[in-house]
């Protein structure tokens, strides 16, 4: 421990001062000596440099003393310069030499944890040996000398879950831990100097270890059975109730999705409210109490996010059973048909049966209904209904030729709840009866010229019948017996028309101005009806070409003349 730059004349010994030394001061440190020193008092030793005189001094024999207690942690060595001179001549005997006085360490410092408080986070269920964090203590003592600053770490609190590596201070997990059982641990670590030997100092640090969540829990329904009700009047899309599962995980690891596992009726759906983490049971199809009054569905719940490595915790989804009761809504009676079509022959006596309507109270098979006819303000009441059994009868004979169809509205009212009323339309067709004889289809103006020849067609006639004209409806035409048959003939064309022909010639206006032909028209109804229709034939003065237009004009003037006489 000396520095000898130029000369080997200096005799050194290692110079140390033990810090914090409390023996009597001044205290001998060591000897400074030149090999030229004959110890006759002729040489003088001079000390300069750090702490010379104030901390260290040297006597005439070259003995160095320390005046006061030293602290290595404040200053661990002092650099001094030694001179030796001839006391008389004041000339150096040796070259100046620099040397060091080291302050020897004693264990006077406790270890210190400077980075606290320590907080660490590690995922739950991490495997044994997982590094959690590292704690490091410092010691003011000399790390290069002895064991004063050599630290050993140990666990004071935290077994059996954690361990600490003695030399490094690395904290590790010693078992898999479940956050859902305990989510925070306080670990106390001790750092001891002197490698744990006697007289060692120690310090402790508390490490707060938080377990972060992993998705190691599947959601589980709170109830194995849920009971919900839905009104049969509820529209599709109605929320009929909620179901709820719990998940011991937190955050996104607890986010869940509900779904239908089993619903053969395909009547319901389940959606997830991600804010409340509830499952909402939704009506997908309308329900009908009278068709089915309860339903059973099975719902399941799964986590939204499950990493592949955690799937082992989610093998079988939790399920629950939901009993859904349909609530009866008192509905109006239901007619067997939305509208009825009935028929009745025209002319039948009043009180004749037209048909029957029927309605029933679906809410109660035993409950009776009351029937009635909605009367129009201006309609004549042609029908009545039996309020108990729904039979409709006529109140007077019907005439198809006045109205071939009647439209009435019938109502059915629940006897136990008269507010519940339903309606049905009844269309009544009046069937034709052959109760009208045929007649001329129009008024005919028929003329015959005085110079007409036999066999001349003077008029085509057709007939109409107020009865229903069926496809095979036929009219037959003939002259009524023994009337003017010598002057005219009727030829039936077999197509519901007939021709009137002259039978002879020599018509004279002077002799007979008009002929009245009674024509018999017969229909093919059942029973057939006939009528006699009179055709008036006017005789007129015609030109040579038998021009009836001229004739008509003449006849017209003549008729005026007749009427004024």
């Amino acid at each position: 421990d000396y520095k000898d730059d130029d000369d080997k004349g200096w005799v050194w010994e290692p110079l140390f001062v033990t810090e914090e030394e409390t023996s009597t001061m001044p205290m001998y440190v060591g000897q400074l000596k030149s090999d030229l020193d004959k110890e006759d008092g002729s040489l003088q030793y001079i000390l300069t440099g750090e702490g010379a005189d104030s901390i260290f001094f040297i006597n005439e024999h070259g003995k160095i003393y320390v005046r006061q207690k030293l602290d290595r942690e404040k200053k661990s060595f002092y650099i001094l310069r030694a001179q030796v001179i001839n006391r008389k001549t004041r000339h150096p005997i040796e070259p100046d030499s620099e040397f060091i006085i080291k302050v020897r360490d004693i264990n006077d410092h406790e270890p210190q944890f400077l980075d606290g408080p320590y907080v660490a986070t590690v995922p739950e269920m991490s495997p044994e040996g997982t590094s959690v964090t590292q704690v490091t203590a410092t010691d003011g003592d000399d790390p290069s000398y002895g064991n004063n600053a050599r630290l050993l770490y140990s666990l004071i609190q935290g077994q059996p879950y954690f361990s600490v590596e003695p030399k490094t201070g690395v904290i590790r997990m010693t078992s898999q831990m479940d956050r859902e059982t305990k989510d925070q641990y306080l670990v106390v670590i001790q750092a001891k100097d002197m490698v744990g030997q006697a007289g060692a100092f120690s310090a402790t640090a508390t490490v707060t270890i938080n377990l972060s969540d992993v998705n190691d829990n599947k959601p589980i329904f709170k109830e194995s059975l849920y009971r919900l009700t839905v009104s049969e009047s509820a529209p599709t899309g109605t929320s009929i109730g909620t179901i709820m599962a719990y998940d011991n995980d937190i955050g996104e690891n607890a986010e869940m999705d509900y779904s239908i596992e089993e619903d053969d009726s395909q009547t319901f759906d389940i959606i997830t409210n991600h804010e409340t983490q509830e499952g909402i049971v939704i009506l997908k199809k309308k329900v009908d109490f009278e068709h089915q009054n309860h339903y059973g569905i099975r719902a399941k719940v799964k986590n939204h996010h499950v990493p592949e490595q955690l799937m082992k915790y989610h093998t079988e989804a939790s399920t629950t059973f939901i009993k859904i009761q349909v609530e009866d809504v008192d509905e109006p009676p239901v007619f067997t048909l939305e509208s009825y079509v009935m028929e009745i022959a025209e002319g039948v006596v009043s009180g004749s049966l037209v048909g029957t309507v029927s309605a029933r109270d679906l809410d109660n098979d035993d409950s009776s209904v009351r029937y009635s006819i909605v009367q129009g303000l201006h309609l004549k009441r042609l029908f009545s209904i039996n309020e108990h059994n729904g039979t409709i009868i006529t109140t007077e004979p019907l005439d198809r030729e006045k109205a071939s169809w009647h439209n009435i509205t019938v109502t059915a009212t629940e006897t136990r709840n008269p507010e519940k009323i339903s309606e049905a339309n009844v269309y009544i067709q009046v069937l034709d009866v052959n109760d009208h004889a045929p007649e001329f289809s129009k008024y005919y103006e028929t003329f015959v010229c005085e110079n007409a020849v036999p066999g001349q067609l003077i008029q085509n006639i057709s007939a109409v019948d107020k009865d229903d004209s069926a496809e095979n409806h036929r009219f037959y035409f003939s002259l009524a017996q023994a009337t003017n048959s010598s002057h005219f003939t009727v030829k039936d064309n077999q197509d519901n028309t007939a021709g009137i022909f002259t039978a002879g010639s020599g018509f004279s206006r002077k002799e007979q101005f008009y002929f009245f032909l009674p024509i018999l028209i017969l229909d093919n109804g059942s029973p057939p009806l006939t009528s006699t229709n009179t055709l008036t034939v006017t005789v007129c003065d015609c030109d040579t070409e038998v021009n009836t237009l001229y004739c008509r004009y003449g006849a017209f003037l003549y008729s005026i003349g007749l009427s004024t006489e």
């Epitope: 194995s224 059975l225 009971r227 009700t229 053969d264 009726s265 009278e290 068709h291 089915q292 009054n293 309860h294 339903y295 059973g296 059973f321 009993k323 009761q325 609530e327």
Partner: antibody, heavy 119, light 107 residues
Amino acid sequence: QVQLVESGGGVVQPGRSLRLSCAASGFTFSSYDMHWVRQAPGKGLEWVAVISYDGTNEYYADSVKGRFTISRDTSKNTLYLQMNSLRAEDTAVYYCARERYFDWSFDYWGQGTLVSVSS
Amino acid sequence: EIVLTQSPGTLSLSPGERATLSCRASQSVSNTYLAWYHQRPGQAPRLLIYGASSRATGIPDRFSGSGSGTDFALTISSLEPEDFAVYYCQQYSNSWTFGQGTKVEIK
């Protein structure tokens, strides 16, 4: 073990009333829907009425609607059937039955009580 | 209401024989909501099968149920003396109705 014991049956004149009781034990009465079923002498089974586990809903067969009332007293673990305006055709053995928790079938039945309506 | 028709009305068989009972619904029974009961003389009915094919607690495996929609069956693979009784099917899709019963008697 689950037990259902009916009582209150007897002979009654047409038009009169009768109240049947069914004492339940061996299970959590308040968790189950309960029913009455009857069986006319020598005939088959006929469902009569049901009441929900919490007593809020009741349903009846059309044949008894408006005349019979089903009720329950959870504090006494007892089911009731109030029968009014009795008719001859109401003559039967009346059974109370428990509805299965996860189903609508009847997993436990009482031994029945006979109601005879005659003048 | 859903009407259940059971056939045959009576079944005469010997112990050890196989029994097949039929139950037909007037309209489709949703979600196989059908149960079978048996009733011995003077006793209350006892649940055998629910959900058309699931055996109730304590029911021996010689009893099995099958079917869906409108046609259901109860099969007793080998009749035991205590199996001779009246068997009822019940639907619980729409309210609750029972069949008229099938009597299984000793031949």
